[in-house]
């Protein structure tokens, strides 16, 4: 079964900076990934970032730099102040889409514990929804 | 199917602004983003920005950053671009496009003359 | 910015021939997490709006005729078109998928003799 991770991680330089990593455990072939915040992308989340592995990047405010770190993984970095900002516990949601699994969601936030430049390992997040 | 509806012309004054729209249906509006393209006489395809209508965020080519305000209405499933300080070189085609260009409306006109 | 280059500005040939046409772009339009490059080619018929033709380089959008052929990586780019028709009269703009703002280039004029 495929699976998606997420990892949430606050600059230790900004603290109103955090990167966003996810990634595709899987054997399909990615068609297209968003990134969204404060939930799943379509139920009340807001989207942040689309990565086509062919058609390129587009990104929003308060997202900053969204590339490909492999063929299988992403990376986001946001940045913001005043209401646009995101905080410690904001929801971060990353929705794969693939041939021939379908669409995998999961999302994450910043370990409660941690501390600027520390994040959790790159662990495999629940999967909310799969369609 | 995927439509993007806009009026056919705008005739307007120096120093106006205009506020064109472009009409999405066939698709849910707030998960595909709208860019706008200018196209000048005699000259190339021009990026200006683009807008997601479900975060209504915008990102603008710096060249139009002071001029053009992009904005969505939701309800009525429609983009809209305003174009401010109008001079005759904004005298254009302008193309709304959706998310990476690969559906197009028919664009509108703009016509700068007093 | 990144600045799109097409050469030549225009040309034209007899139905049936094939034709070349270049992209030169500023900066190297190829994503290293995935090794895609991202750019596509328009193709804008007289009174219509354009229309997508090729994406990442070299993949046609489903529909096109597969005499449009794409290839090139980084900044060095070229659409052919193995047997050029009369409703391939148009102008071919390519663009730069790459990064903010997505810069076309001045494009090719295709016409039939």
């Known amino acids: 079964t495929p699976e998606v991770w997420v990892q949430v991680r606050m600059e230790a330089t900004e603290l109103s900076s955090f990167t966003i990593r996810c990634g595709f455990l899987g054997s399909g072939s990615i068609s297209l990934v968003t990134v969204s915040w404060g939930g799943p992308n379509g139920a009340g989340g807001t989207t942040l970032a689309v990565l086509h592995p062919e058609r390129g990047i587009r990104q929003w405010a308060p997202a900053r730099q969204a590339r490909w770190e492999t063929q299988s993984s992403i990376s986001l970095i946001l940045e913001g102040s005043g209401a646009s900002s995101p905080c410690a516990n904001t929801t971060f949601c990353c929705k794969f889409a693939s041939f021939p699994e379908g669409s995998w969601e999961a999302c994450g936030s910043l370990p409660p514990s941690s501390d600027p430049g520390l994040s959790a390992p790159p662990t495999p997040a629940p999967i909310l929804r799969a369609d | 199917q995927v439509q993007l509806q806009q009026p056919g012309a705008e005739l307007v004054k120096p120093g106006t602004s205009v506020k064109l729209s472009c009409k999405a249906s066939?698709?849910?509006?707030?998960s595909y983003w709208i860019n706008w393209v200018k196209l000048a006489p005699g000259q190339g395809l021009e990026w200006?920005?683009?807008?997601?209508?479900?975060?209504?965020?915008?990102n603008y080519n710096e060249k139009f950053k002071n001029r053009a305000t992009l904005t969505v209405d939701t309800s009525a499933s429609t983009a809209y671009m305003e174009l401010s300080s109008l001079a005759s070189e904004d005298s254009a085609l302008y193309y709304c496009?959706?998310?990476?260009?690969?559906?197009w409306g028919q664009g509108t006109t703009v016509t700068v003359s007093s | 910015d990144i600045v799109m280059t097409q050469s030549p500005s225009s040309l034209s040939v007899s139905a049936g021939e094939k034709v070349t046409m270049s992209c030169k772009s500023s900066q190297s339009l190829l994503s290293s997490g995935n090794q895609k490059n991202y750019l596509a080619w328009y193709q804008q018929k007289p009174g219509q709006p354009p229309k997508l033709l090729i994406y990442g380089a070299s993949t046609r959008e489903s529909g096109v005729p597969d005499r449009f052929t794409g290839s090139g990586s980084g900044t060095d780019f070229t659409l052919t078109i193995s047997s050029v028709q009369a409703e391939d009269l148009a102008v071919y703009y390519c663009?730069?998928?790459?990064?903010?703002?997505?810069?076309f280039g001045g494009g090719t004029k295709l016409e039939i003799k």
């Open positions: 066939g698709y849910t509006f707030t």
């Open positions: 496009a959706g998310g990476y260009f690969d559906v």
């Open positions: 200006i920005g683009d807008i997601y209508p479900g975060s209504y965020i915008p």
């Open positions: 663009q730069n998928d790459h990064s903010y703002p997505y810069t």
